[in-house]
């Protein structure tokens, strides 16, 4: 009679995480008498998955009734599969022995691969804000997927980006994998409303990719442009000077008026107007009592935006054309910012 062979007909089996894996195994003979055991791995570190003779294996069920005398089907089902279950499974026939059963013949092994979905991509931008024309890096990470093959794309406002580098780890075989990608994005002044999107496609997602987004409003700083103008004289000795602060983002802004280098007033941008592109405009004005000045006045609008070094714009106020009012020593009125846009 021909010697018993252990047949594992499936070289590989692919199962989605959470599903049940069926590992097939048949023997070609009832002799020698002895139990079957299933192992993951062939080496000294192999792990016992099922022992026909003894033990408790709650996730494993047999396909046929192993208690029947003439049974030669030793296939098993493993429930609730996770990526950690990946590996090569061996169906091993033991020969009855005393005191211990002796390993007799192994099947060729069935490689169990687990399909696991990637986690939702997490996109993160730079720690500090950057200004238009600068290049910033965004990272995208997704974890826990299997098999290793995966596609990652970057978009900015629907336009695909090309300047990025992607790594899938680990390089060798693993139960599951992670992807890490870094994209470079050049900022423009119009990017306050822009979004950067990382899109991950994987066989487990059935053509419906996962997306992670980052708003460039968290990343961009648009510095303001300043314009100081002198309005027509309101009263005999008063001049209205306005400082237009335009196209800035974010809103955090402090403005200081200086008269001939001396601080006249400091205020914080509160009631701003929003532009279509998401940037803000704001205006502050100063009433200058020209009769208090013998000489020309240098008025400076100094703006500190989002904790950056101050930028300023100056305006020379000619006072020689105005008659001096005796007894006045007030250089400027501490008015609040004008909520009306005066152009």
């Amino acid at each position: 009679e021909e010697e018993l062979q252990v047949i594992q007909p499936d070289k590989s089996v692919l199962v989605a995480a959470g599903e049940t894996a069926t590992l097939r195994c048949t023997a070609t003979s009832l002799i020698p008498v002895g139990p079957i055991q299933w192992f993951r791995g062939a080496g000294p570190g192999r792990e016992l998955i099922y022992n026909q003779k003894e033990g408790h294996f709650p996730r494993v069920t047999t396909v046929s009734d192993l208690t029947k005398r003439n049974n030669m089907d030793f296939s098993i089902r493993i429930g609730n599969i996770t990526p950690a279950d990946a590996g090569t499974y061996y169906c091993v026939k033991f020969r009855k022995g005393s005191p211990d059963d002796v390993e007799f013949k192994s099947g060729a092994g069935t490689e169990l691969s687990v399909r696991a979905k990637p986690s939702a991509p997490v996109v993160s931008g730079p720690a500090a804000r950057a200004t238009p024309q600068h290049t910033v890096s965004f990272t995208c990470e997704s974890h826990g997927f299997s098999p290793r093959d995966i596609t990652l794309k970057w978009f900015k406002n629907g336009n695909e980006l090309s300047d990025f580098q992607t790594n899938v780890d680990p390089v060798g075989e693993s139960v599951s994998y992670s992807i890490h990608s870094t994209a470079k994005v050049v900022l423009t002044r119009e990017d306050v409303h822009s979004q950067v999107i990382c899109e991950v496609a994987h066989v487990t997602l059935q053509g419906d990719p996962l997306r992670g987004t980052a708003n460039l409003s968290e990343t961009i700083r648009v510095p303001p442009t300043l314009e100081v103008t002198q309005q027509p004289v309101r009263a005999e000795n008063q001049v209205n000077v306005t400082c237009q602060v335009r196209k800035f983002y974010p809103q955090r802004l402090q403005l200081t008026w200086l008269e001939n280098g001396n601080v006249s007033r400091t205020e914080t941008a509160s009631t701003v107007t929003e532009n279509k592109d998401g940037t803000y405009n704001w205006m502050s004005w100063l009433l200058v009592n020209v009769s208090a000045h013998r000489d020309d006045v240098k008025l400076t609008c100094q703006v500190e935006h989002d904790g950056q070094p101050a930028v300023s714009k100056s305006h020379d106020l000619k006072v020689s054309a105005h008659p001096k009012e005796q007894g006045s020593n007030t250089a400027a009125e501490n008015t609040g910012s004008n909520e009306r846009n005066i152009y």
Epitope: V6, R40, G41, A42, G43, P44, G45, R46, E47, G87, T88, Y90, V92, K93, G97, D100, V102, E103, F104, K105, S106, P170, E173, S174, V175
Partner: antibody, heavy 115, light 110 residues
Amino acid sequence: SVEESGGRLVTPGTPLTLACTVSGFSLISYYISWVRQAPEKGLEYIGIINIGGGASYASWAKGRFTISKTSTTVDLKITSPTPEDTATYFCAMSYGMDTGAFNIWGPGTLVTVSL
Amino acid sequence: AQVLTQTPASVSAAVGGTVTISCQSSESVYKNNFLSWYQQKPGKPPKLLIYGASTLASGVPSRFKGSGSGTQFTLTISDLESDDAATYFCQGGYRTDIYPFGGGTEVVVK
């Protein structure tokens, strides 16, 4: 003891089978691994087989090597040798060990792959 | 793939001295202790020194000491003898059923 045999000069692409003969053990349970060492290089694990004949391989070795068991030997087949496969091939036995260590080694057999 | 990084590549010490070799695994070895150390001399097969990360193999002097767990392991050779001049390899065993070696460390005894 374990002893390798079959090492020789072969031309690239010509399959070669090495044998590892095991003697002097009551073989209730053992594992035999094949390891190679290129001249002046380190040890490189190829794969392993157990007494029942179940074999597994290093990822780089899959398809390039086949480990099988006969009644008297454990064989390593180099399916399509290249000059990079030139090395001394060792078979190493893990006997009575449960931590993946190989405590019995053969002297090695030299394989040279050259035109 | 699982990678075992051995440092240093070469070390020199005087007779009676102590040598420490490090072996770092890219992932935890199986059961945190599937790590062995071997000694190899030119023209000879490797000889098992330590298994299970810290257990001395039969006939190996107690001057050889293995320690560590998980991903970081150390072989220490104290009271160095001239006969200890050799190349030393670590070997890990992994859940994925592979048993690779580190790159080796040459020990020179002065």
